[in-house]
């Protein structure tokens, strides 16, 4: 969480942003809140990006003002106009690209004063893994698949019964480039699996960590998946 304060002249107002990560090809949110004002026409929101000449987005006098918007953001940004009055300056970003990563500034002017806060935005690809029993294999084998990751993640297997065991010798992980030539499909195979055990396939890069669990017993198979974004901190 980053909390910024305004400077000289008018009073300062508190602006708060949250560092976040965008999944390339999907929509992202750059979060920013501020002390609200009672009049929408008195609120100015400017989003800027370090190293970019034009504005990312501007909202003032109750409407979007995009004549100074940078070319890389054309047609890709929107504020939640109906929520500006309650202090929400968050920005929606369409079709996140790798190049959208960087430091953004949320700059606010209201009748109470000015304020700004920076936001670190990471971009990459992350997806939920699915673990299945590979019935085509000669021995009991598990197959962990996740369709989209970038940068290339690490894959680690773990088991509830053999806690602390190193499965690198009995597993094989491959990365297959997807059609858009950026993200990759992750496939990891674990051999010599025993029943009545819970196995976890953990995929991690510097943006996200995802886990796919599978519990194999003689009577049933139970699965569970979980994905967590790393380094989400507020300013």
């Amino acid at each position: 969480l980053i909390i910024g304060f305004g400077i000289s002249g008018r009073h300062s107002i508190t602006v708060t942003t949250v560092a976040s990560a965008g999944n390339i090809g999907e929509d992202g949110i750059l979060s920013c809140t501020f002390e609200p004002d009672i009049k929408l026409s008195d609120i100015v929101i400017q989003w800027l990006k370090e190293g970019v000449l034009g504005l990312v987005h501007e909202f003032k006098e109750g409407k979007d003002e995009l004549s100074e918007q940078d070319e890389m953001f054309r047609g890709r940004t929107a504020v939640f106009a109906d929520q500006v009055i309650v202090g929400n300056a968050s920005l929606r970003l369409k079709n996140v690209q790798l190049t959208d990563a960087g430091t953004y500034k949320c700059y606010i002017i209201t009748s109470k004063g000015k304020g700004n806060a920076n936001l670190e935005y990471k971009t990459g690809a992350f997806s939920m893994p699915e673990v299945n029993v590979d019935y085509n294999a000669s021995s009991e084998t598990l197959r962990c698949e996740a369709p989209r990751w970038f940068p290339q993640p690490t894959v680690v297997w773990a088991s509830q019964v053999d806690q602390g065991a190193n499965f690198s010798e009995v597993s094989n992980t491959s990365f297959e480039l997807n059609s858009e030539n950026v993200t990759m499909k992750v496939v990891s195979v674990l051999y010599n699996v025993t029943i009545n055990n819970t196995y976890s396939c953990m995929i991690e890069n510097d943006i996200a960590k995802a886990t796919g669990d599978i519990k194999v017993t003689e009577s049933e198979i139970k699965r569970r998946s979980h994905l967590q974004l790393l380094n989400s901190k507020a300013s």
């Epitope: 090809g25 999907e26 929509d27 034009g54 987005h57 409407k63 979007d64 003002e65 995009l66 004549s67 100074e68 918007q69 940078d70 070319e71 054309r74 047609g75 890709r76 940004t77 929107a78 929606r92 369409k94 079709n95």
Partner: antibody, heavy 119, light 107 residues
Framework: QIQLKESGPGLVQPSQSLSITCTVS????????VHWVRQSPGKGLEWLGV???????DYNSAFISRLSISKDNSKSQVFFKMNSLQADDTAIYYC?????????????WGQGTLVTVSA | IIVMTQSPKSMSMSVGERITLNCKAS??????VSWYQQKPEQSPKLLIY???NRYTGVPDHFTGSGSATDFTLTISSVQAEDLADYHC?????????FGSGTKLEIK
């Protein structure tokens, strides 16, 4: 309220150029992009291009060599020019505006101007 | 170029019937699909945007659903005034593209 209105020549000679003006009201061209879409007789809709608030343009690659879109913010007018027209360019030409600043759907359309390419 | 394939090309329905129009994208377009109704001699009218959001003033018997590559427009109870062509379009990536349309006729 929000309105867009196209004005065009109606008839264009083969190999000649087409100029259409879209005059908008109820919103500012510095807030929203304006798109151009055409519809050939009995056919589907075809997106041709857009001019964004900042003046940047994006064109359908099939038309990039003969299409130009410009605007005058102060007059609330968008100008569409297509060169080297042939018979299969006969269509209704529409200007349209998106529902938000992110293109999610064309909520506002002009009435369209029918352009016939014929000698 | 993302190709939007609409099916069926045309359909004839009785008033009160439920119908589903389909639109398939050749690549993932997220939820950037919109649906339009076009009556004879009129401009297209936006019905659904963002795959499932009903536009202001659109009757609630129109419903959109889907994501990625498969999208549907459902008319829960067809009215005589629903006689029109229906187009889907994607605004996920350039060039934006539309399907070839479905003509809805009333029996």
């Amino acid at each position: 309220q929000i309105q867009l209105k196209e004005s065009g020549p109606g008839l264009v000679q083969p190999s000649q150029s087409l100029s259409i003006t879209c005059t908008v009201s109820g919103f500012s061209l510095t807030s929203y992009g304006v798109h151009w879409v055409r519809q050939s007789p009995g056919k589907g809709l075809e997106w041709l291009g857009v001019i964004w608030s900042g003046g940047y343009t994006d064109y359908n690659s099939a038309f990039i060599s003969r299409l130009s879109i410009s605007k005058d913010n102060s007059k609330s007018q968008v100008f569409f020019k297509m060169n080297s027209l042939q018979a299969d360019d006969t269509a209704i030409y529409y200007c349209a505006r998106d529902i938000t600043t992110i293109v999610e759907g064309f909520a506002y359309w002009g009435q369209g101007t029918l352009v016939t390419v014929s000698a | 170029i993302i190709v939007m394939t609409q099916s069926p090309k045309s359909m004839s329905m009785s008033v009160g019937e439920r119908i589903t129009l389909n639109c398939k994208a050749s690549e993932n377009v997220g939820t950037y699909v919109s649906w339009y109704q076009q009556k004879p001699e009129q401009s297209p009218k936006l019905l659904i945007y963002g795959a499932s959001n009903r536009y202001t003033g659109v009757p609630d018997h129109f419903t959109g659903s889907g994501s990625a590559t498969d999208f549907t427009l459902t008319i829960s109870s067809v009215q005589a005034e629903d006689l029109a062509d229906y187009h889907c379009g994607q605004t996920y990536s350039y060039p934006f593209t539309f399907g070839s349309g479905t003509k809805l006729e009333i029996k």
